[in-house]
């Protein structure tokens, strides 16, 4: 495939990445799949600067990111190391709360109304953000 040099239509470029901001809601797994079908991934926040950029675009709305602990450890969907990476949890989070009564705890991370992170039930239909890197080879065949 060829190297992507500019963002697709309706995507926002920032720091050599492209971002797409949903206006509807999906469960985390469906949002994850949506991004993958776009040759992208749920947003992976690697810095305070990127946090502020995303926060500015989503506003005070619960929004999924590409962080989950459905297999035990917290993992970013692109393989970025959680342990050494940027974190912006709300105080007292993550708490893997069981009191919602929906079964299981809380395994998926989202931006809250103030931008800080919370873990929540992955089935909740929140908005989401897809991200893809401009320097990444695209799956589309090169134009001849």
């Amino acid at each position: 495939g060829s190297e992507r040099t500019c963002c697709p239509v309706n995507w926002v470029e920032h720091e050599r990445s492209c971002y797409w901001f949903s206006r509807s809601g999906k469960a985390w797994a469906d949002a994850d799949n949506y991004c993958r079908l776009e040759d992208a991934h749920l947003v992976v926040v690697t810095s305070w600067e990127e946090q502020k950029f995303v926060q500015h675009h989503i506003g005070p709305v619960n929004t999924w990111m590409g962080l989950h602990d459905q297999n035990g450890p917290w993992k970013w969907v692109d393989g970025t190391d959680y342990e050494t990476g940027f974190k912006n949890w709300r105080p007292e989070q993550p708490d893997d709360w069981y009191g919602h009564g929906l079964g299981g705890g809380e395994d998926c991370a989202h931006f809250t109304d103030d931008g800080r992170w919370n873990d929540d039930v992955c089935q909740r239909p929140y908005r989401w953000v897809c991200e893809t890197e401009l320097d990444k080879a695209s799956q589309e065949p090169p134009l001849l």
């Epitope: 035990g72 993550p94 708490d95 893997d96 709360w97 079964g103 705890g105």
Partner: antibody, heavy 115, light 107 residues
């Protein structure tokens, strides 16, 4: 590498107390709930207690409620189990384990309650 | 409380055999089920998380399936190091509960 190391087990008389500790390393401790699980000699596994990452939520098995207290110190990356009013049936190997699906376990510490 | 049952309670098998252990929950637990292997004198080891997710470092001969109330752990080709006791555990709701275990020994 994730590591959990329990300590504090030993022989105690019925009605006595013991405090177990579990020291964690290799992960962001405050991001994970922690659990105590026990296994009586020759028996199966029994969940004892859980505490959420920042200690906001605590849960106990009915068999230990009112006698055992779970706590954690995130600065020290440790979780504790204070066991009071111990009974013979509390005799077991006590394990600490990470998260609700118990993905990592310590080696265990033996608690023997006997006169 | 959710009760977990396992069958069989024990089984005898030979190296190379395909082994299947079943676990049943007394009420639906979605996929909030884990499987563990325990050898005598050792701590349990996590094999499967989320009913079918293989834990990091666990060989692919282990697989898990099921959802709701009925679950299965399969060892595709039993090796000498696999003779042990296997437990299932639900983490759908507190109190977390374990199955009674299935002991796999030499035929």
């Amino acid at each position: 590498e994730v590591q959990l190391v329990e300590s504090g087990g030993g022989l105690v008389k019925p009605g006595g107390s013991l405090r177990l500790s579990c020291a964690a390393s290799g992960f962001t401790f405050s991001s994970y709930s922690m659990n105590w699980v026990r296994q009586a000699p020759g028996k199966g596994l029994e969940w004892v207690s859980s505490i959420s990452g920042t200690g906001s939520f605590i849960y106990y098995a009915d068999s230990v409620k009112g006698r055992f207290t779970i706590s954690r110190d995130n600065a020290k990356k440790s979780v504790y189990l204070q066991m009071n009013s111990l009974r013979a049936e509390d005799t077991a190997v006590y394990y600490c384990a990470r998260v609700s699906g118990f993905d990592y376990w310590g080696q265990g510490t033996l608690v023997t309650v006997s006169s | 409380d959710i009760q977990m049952t396992q069958s069989p309670s024990s089984l005898s098998a030979s190296v190379g055999d395909r082994v299947t252990i079943t676990c049943r929950a007394s009420q639906a637990i979605s996929n909030y089920l884990a499987w563990f292997q325990q050898k005598p004198g050792k701590a349990p080891k996590s094999l499967i998380y989320g009913a079918s997710g293989l834990q990091s470092g666990v060989p692919s001969k282990f697989s898990g399936s099921g959802s709701g109330t009925d679950f299965t752990l399969t060892i595709s080709s039993l090796q000498p190091e696999d003779f042990a006791t296997y437990y299932c555990q639900q983490y759908n709701s507190y109190p977390f509960t374990f199955g009674p275990g299935t002991k796999v020994d030499f035929k």
